[in-house]
């Protein structure tokens, strides 16, 4: 036989079907001209001392063979002994190990076989109605298709899905789409109408993402503020990546899972942004706010579940670094300016309520005084912490009031609002003898001691109404009872308690009488 | 000479079975692929099975995979098609064919009608 044509015997190798997974698969034949033919196919397995021959059956029942040698392609003219008008089976044959090895056969008319092209370039993928809608152009020329996909999940096999006839200048295929897994899907073309045409090869991998982007798994930790008035949050735990299916690891555009963090700034609900969004790569320094973080996972399909926590508010004060002054016209706060035009944040809540309480005020943008100090004053009218209460007081400071992660702290600290001087004055004042010269003075504690690092000190005064000599004596804040001694029997006393802070003298309480009886011997 | 005659055929039932029998002369049975062919009324040759020469490889039309059987007995020079699950449409003259020259018998002739 001559090696163009195809040889009426039967091949020349024994006859043993090995029976075995590997060997000739996806045989496609097509004409390639007006009168030239190819036949293509895949082989699986060990190719070394492979030989290939491509077996037809024509109609008439008489069968013949090319001997394609290890090639995996072969082609022929219409002279071949070949019908290429009327309907052959053709099969692939590979001798290997003294043994044949069969792919499946193609049954076509030859001439009418058109080499198909799988769908080329942009693949585009949506979401419709719970199901995975792909859309592509056809390829030039080949308008009216057959389309098939196949798809696979991490943990399954190739699925077989048919995505109906195609006429159109661009073709679509309706395929399932899994919820928690993500799938990888090829889709493959043949010519529509036209008995027993050659399947194109599969396409490029589609790799789609689960409907649910996973649920993130992280855990976060927030360091200690810094001098700087900032602490950097931390990703203890990173998020698990999602499994892939074979053709999409490495590589696998479509399947992406972004983590985005939402930061939510609760405190100072003054400010012009309290909402900000950011890759979860890139862990931010916040203040000593509380906050509300958010991990958010997306894919193509839009944003998944998110998991939220909750970052308290530093709490740690400093008691001196806020200076407040009170006079007629109103109150006026100082503290140590952080730099050159520097908007502040002045917030304050009562003590023990709600911190959806918290009032504020944000100051225009502000240079340091001469003394290196900046200010905040308001009017008794506003009647901002006009109270006669404990306020807790925070001041941030940002120079990009507009970015929610340059804020910092400055200070967090405790202030007693309204009059304090005369609000803090200390009632139910009582002298009780303690001995023949001394008397132990009690009071209730002052309001100003409900106020952390307000109340300075309580003063206590004994004024001898004999002489009008006066004694002060300092007790400390914790301290609401002083022992009085060197007193004379006799004489008659009047002791008044009032409670300091840092900036202010307070009011003295009721004077109250009193005297050492003359203790008289039997 | 060669000399191909098919047996088996007659008149059947949707859902039943035949096996049709070819036996062969004239030559070296068991050195050649054979073929089964039919020819519908008013329609041209199509082809159905391939055997190979030892039996090894067998090949099927799409239409009547899972439903014939091809088979041979190279020592009594005889080949076999098995068909189950006849449908109306396997009506036809059924020929044995030999494969590298394609002479072939006078047929037999199958029915598939209730």
């Known amino acids: 036989c001559r090696t163009s044509e195809c040889c009426f015997q039967d091949p020349p190798y024994p006859d043993a079907d090995s029976g075995s997974a590997s060997g000739p698969r996806d045989l496609r034949c097509y004409r390639i001209s007006s009168d030239r033919y190819e036949c293509s196919w895949q082989y699986e397995g060990p190719t070394a001392g492979v030989s290939h021959f491509l077996r037809c059956c024509l109609s008439s029942g008489r069968c013949c063979y090319f001997a394609a040698g290890s090639a995996t392609r072969l082609q022929f003219s219409d002279q071949a002994g070949v019908s290429v008008l009327y309907t052959v089976t053709l099969w692939v044959e590979s001798w290997a190990r003294n043994q044949t090895e069969k792919s499946p056969e193609v049954t076509l008319q030859l001439y009418n076989s058109v080499k198909y092209e799988p769908p080329l370039g942009d693949i585009k993928v949506s979401k419709l109605a719970g199901q995975l809608r792909m859309e592509w152009e056809t390829p030039d020329n080949q308008v009216g298709a057959e389309v098939q996909f196949r798809h696979r999940t991490p943990s399954s096999p190739w699925k077989l899905g048919d995505c109906g006839p195609q006429d159109d200048d661009t073709e679509s295929c309706l395929c399932p789409l899994e919820m928690n897994v993500a799938q990888e899907f090829q889709l493959r073309r043949r010519q529509l109408g036209s008995q027993g045409s050659s399947w194109s090869k599969w396409s490029s991998p589609v790799c789609v993402p689960p409907e649910n982007p996973p649920q993130p798994q992280v855990r976060f930790s927030v360091e200690q503020l810094g001098q700087d008035g900032r602490r950097r949050l931390t990703l203890k735990e990173q998020p698990t990546q999602l499994e892939l299916p074979e053709g999409c690891q490495g590589l696998a555009p479509g399947t992406e899972v972004t983590y985005r963090l939402q930061l939510h700034m609760l405190s100072c609900p003054c400010k012009a942004k309290a909402t900000r969004t950011l890759h979860l790569g890139k862990m931010p320094y916040l203040s000593g706010a509380a906050y509300n973080v958010a991990v958010i996972s997306s894919n193509q399909f839009g944003p998944g579940l998110n998991q939220t926590w909750h970052i308290p508010a530093d709490t740690h004060t400093e008691p001196v670094a806020l200076n407040i002054s009170v006079g007629t016209n109103g109150t006026t706060m100082y503290w140590p300016a952080r730099a050159q035009s520097m908007t502040y944040c002045i917030e304050w809540q009562p003590v023990g309520q709600d911190g959806g309480l918290a009032t504020c005020s944000l100051t225009a943008p502000q240079d340091p005084d001469p003394a290196g100090m900046a200010t905040y004053s308001w009017s008794r009218e506003s009647g901002a912490m006009g109270q006669e209460k404990c306020y807790y007081i925070t001041i941030f400071a940002s120079a990009h009031p507009e970015k929610l992660t340059l804020w910092s702290t400055v200070l967090s600290t405790y202030h007693f609002g309204g009059n304090a001087s005369a609000a803090g004055t200390p009632h139910h004042v009582s002298v009780k003898n303690h001995s023949l010269d001394s008397v132990s003075v009690d009071w209730a504690p002052s309001l100003l001691s409900t106020c952390p690092g307000v109340l300075k000190e309580y003063v206590v005064r004994c004024r001898d109404e004999d002489s009008k000599q006066v004694s002060e004596h300092p007790v400390q804040p914790t301290e609401t009872q002083v022992t009085l001694s060197g007193l004379r029997a006799g004489v008659a006393y009047t002791v008044q308690v009032r409670a300091d802070t840092a900036w202010l003298r307070g009011v003295w309480s009721q004077p109250q009488r009193f005297s050492i009886e003359v203790q008289v011997s039997d | 000479q060669l000399q191909l005659v098919e047996s088996g055929g007659g008149l059947v039932q949707p859902g039943g079975s035949l096996r049709l029998s070819c036996a062969a002369s004239g030559f070296t049975f068991s050195s050649y692929g054979m073929s089964w062919v039919r020819q519908a009324p008013g329609k041209g040759l199509e082809w159905v099975s391939y055997?190979?020469?030892?039996?090894?490889?067998?090949t099927y039309v799409d239409f009547v995979k899972g439903r014939f059987t091809i088979s041979r007995d190279n020592a009594k020079n005889m080949l076999y098609l098995q068909m189950n699950s006849l449908k109306p449409e396997d009506t036809a003259v059924y020929y044995c064919?030999?494969?590298?020259?394609?002479?072939r018998g006078q047929g037999t002739q199958v029915t598939v009608s209730s």
């Open positions: 055997i190979s020469a030892g039996g090894g490889t067998t």
């Open positions: 064919v030999h494969a590298a020259d394609g002479s």
